[in-house]
Interface confidence: low
């Protein structure tokens, strides 16, 4: 939720990190667009990394990117290829705690 990040300076000493919802598995077709959603909230704002089959996901301009959403992070892959299938994991940390969630794209 947006409110979890919109915290005034008086409350910033209260740190937390929450996985708000597990990641969904995705089934789609070649050439289509897939979106995976990492639903986390925290304070300080969590640093989020995406992994595919345990390797860091590298953004590809105009094809593969991850961006902030009101609920956490969205990984978008355009023009899907067979090589895009695999296990996707998001890992979030606020510097003190770590949470993660895994979904399958196939």
């Amino acid at each position: 939720p947006t409110s979890s990040w919109n915290i005034s300076s008086e409350l910033n000493k209260d740190s937390y990190l929450t996985l708000d919802e597990p990641m969904n598995n995705i089934t789609t077709s070649l050439g289509q667009t897939a979106e995976l959603h990492c639903k986390v909230s925290g304070n300080p704002p969590p640093t989020i990394r995406w992994f595919k089959n345990d390797a860091p996901v590298v953004q590809e301009p105009r094809r593969l990117s991850f961006r902030s959403t009101i609920y956490g992070s969205r990984l978008r892959i355009r023009n899907l290829d067979t090589t895009d299938t695999g296990y996707f994991q998001c890992v979030a940390t606020n510097g003190k705690e770590v949470v993660s969630s895994t979904g399958v794209l196939f």
Epitope: P45, T47, I48, R49, P56, S65, R67, T69
Partner: antibody
């Protein structure tokens, strides 16, 4: 305490080269990205380049693509900006800034003090 | 590429005034928008990220909002230390663009 310290600025002739350094301390360098942002005298901020030192992904503004190269040495906790074929319009204060990785890669939460690059004959 | 059109380029205001600065994106940029404050001779400071999230340690008189492709920074009650230049910034497809800046001056 998070600190970013730029160095390497100075006076260079058009067509010349310069390498800027950004020494980082107070955080786990490989878990963050580094941006270079410049500001010409009396002008606004212009994003120049970004590196995610974890994956070595690099991105550039069109105005510097092919002339500037951003890199990072995680063993030294330092990012670099190699500037070649410098032009008068590259004259600016160059800042390095830390960003979170991933969907917060644009959020520049700590900045250095800046280093001045002057391109003039 | 996306352009961020920031307005006004400058404004004069008094202590206690409510100040609003707007950035319009040339196309949708999700919520990947930040706002920075810069004082003369100093590096910028982060105020707002994700369009509306207040950065740690920033006074609560600063707030951000989004309506479509319009992003707004509001200072609810201007303080003497708030006279500065403010920049919006967006991220889209690994390009990170700043607005032209808004200079807030003393009336």
């Amino acid at each position: 305490e998070v600190q970013l310290v730029e160095s390497g600025g100075g006076l260079v002739q058009p067509g010349g080269s310069l390498r800027l350094s950004c020494a980082a301390s107070g955080f786990t360098f490989s878990w963050y990205g580094i941006h270079w942002v410049r500001q010409a005298p009396g002008k606004g901020l212009e994003w120049v380049a970004y590196i995610d030192s974890y994956t070595s992904s690099t991105y550039y503004a069109d105005s510097v693509k092919g002339r500037f190269t951003i890199s990072a040495d995680t063993s030294k906790n330092t990012a670099y900006l190699q500037m070649n074929s410098l032009r008068a319009e590259d004259t600016a204060v160059y800042y390095c800034a830390r960003s979170h990785f991933g969907h917060y890669d644009y959020v520049m939460d700590y900045w250095g003090q800046g280093t001045l690059v002057t391109v003039s004959s | 590429d996306i352009q961020m059109t920031q307005s006004p380029s400058s404004l004069s205001a008094s202590v206690g005034d409510r100040v609003t600065i707007t950035c319009r994106a040339s196309q949708s940029v999700s919520s990947a928008v930040a706002w920075y404050q810069q004082k003369p001779g100093k590096a910028p400071k982060l105020l707002i990220y994700s369009a509306s999230s207040l950065y740690s340690g920033v006074p609560s008189r600063f707030s951000g909002s989004r309506s479509g492709t319009d992003f707004t920074l509001t200072i609810s009650s201007l303080q003497p230390e708030d006279f500065a230049t403010y920049y919006c910034q967006q991220a889209y497809d690994q390009l990170y663009t700043f607005g032209q800046g808004t200079k807030v001056e003393i009336k």
